[in-house]
Interface confidence: low
Amino acid sequence: YDFTNCDFEKIKAAYLSTISKDLITYMSGTKSTEFNNTVSCSNRPHCLTEIQSLTFNPTAGCASLAKEMFAMKTKAALAIWCPGYSETQINATQAMKKARKSKVTTNKCLEQVSQLQGLWRRFNRPLLKQQ
């Protein structure tokens, strides 16, 4: 999906008002210095690409993020403020339904959400670092 057509300010508002708090809730009890940020982004569309990938694509050791509150709110924000986004996510939704129904917070998931926090901060104010 090409995120360049999204309404960035509306997504930013959604992040600041709710998504950021849900990310903090998920990470509660974890030291902010525990994980190093290894995923980066420069432009806001690039940040959304990385956020979408980390939030909704199951990874080894962390298959359950898509059912978390921050993920559902992220999906809603993208669906509302990125034209045509919903249509591209039909297959992804089917895959999500096949994922485990139980929500398990593994260390790998905590690390992944820590990366997401960094990406969202970059999206909130892109730092235009070297690719």
Epitope: T4, N5, S42, N43, R44, P45, R125, L127, L128, Q130
Partner: antibody, heavy 117, light 107 residues
């Protein structure tokens, strides 16, 4: 209304330094990066570098790393570009431009720097 | 560094003509390309960003498109105020680079 107002034209001798200012208004100064672009007479646009006004982090292209200093004064929402060891090929119009995603939605009016002995 | 090759370097056209300017990136920059218009003695003015998004206040006769690493700026019906120099610029990451410019002159 967003505005970037640059300092006036300068005439300098080779070897001297010049400091160009760019005063921002109409937006939150620390939210946007400030970039500097120059244009030699009759030539195209050349990106020089950028500064993050929130923490003064700078990125400069290799050819300017030794001679350009980018600074900001947050209290006055002003960005500065200082170019040292001036030579004749530095004669150009210098622009400041703000950006969030890498494209420039607002530019300063330009400052002409003439290097002549 | 990413090189931006812009063509033609100049062109002559008449009012009402359809004008096309192209820019080729030396590597994949996705949609991270902007177009600017510059008139003599003035700062450049943003026309298009993210390859095809029209900047605020820019007339709809300007449009942008992308195919792989090839980018196109089209002016559907050239107006007297459109005679100027046009630059492309990638905004994929540092260092930002500009195309060499295309001067649109009156035929």
């Amino acid at each position: 209304e967003v505005q970037l107002v640059q300092s006036g034209a300068e005439v300098k001798k080779p070897g001297a330094s010049v400091k160009v200012s760019c005063k921002a208004s109409g937006y939150t100064f620390t939210t946007y990066w400030m970039h500097w672009v120059r244009q030699a007479p009759g030539q195209g646009l050349e990106w020089m570098g950028m500064i993050d006004p929130s923490d003064s982090e700078t990125t400069l292209i290799q050819k300017f790393k030794d001679r350009v200093t980018l600074t900001v004064d947050k209290s006055t929402s002003t960005a500065y570009m200082e170019l040292s060891s001036l030579r004749s090929e530095d004669t150009a119009v210098y622009y400041c431009a703000r950006t969030l995603d890498g494209y420039y939605d607002y530019w300063g009016q330009g400052t002409t720097v003439t290097v002549s002995s | 560094d990413i090189q931006m090759t812009q063509s033609p370097s100049s062109l002559s056209a008449s009012v009402g003509d359809r004008v096309t300017i192209t820019c080729r990136a030396s590597e994949n920059i996705y949609s991270y390309l902007a177009w600017y218009q510059q008139k003599p003695g003035k700062a450049p003015k943003l026309l298009i960003y993210f390859a095809k998004t029209l900047a605020e206040g820019v007339p709809s006769r300007f449009s942008g498109s992308v195919s792989g690493t090839d980018f196109t700026l089209t002016i559907s019906s050239l107006q007297p105020e459109d005679f100027a120099t046009y630059y492309c610029q990638h905004h994929y990451g540092t260092p930002w680079t500009f195309g060499g410019g295309t001067k649109v002159e009156i035929k």
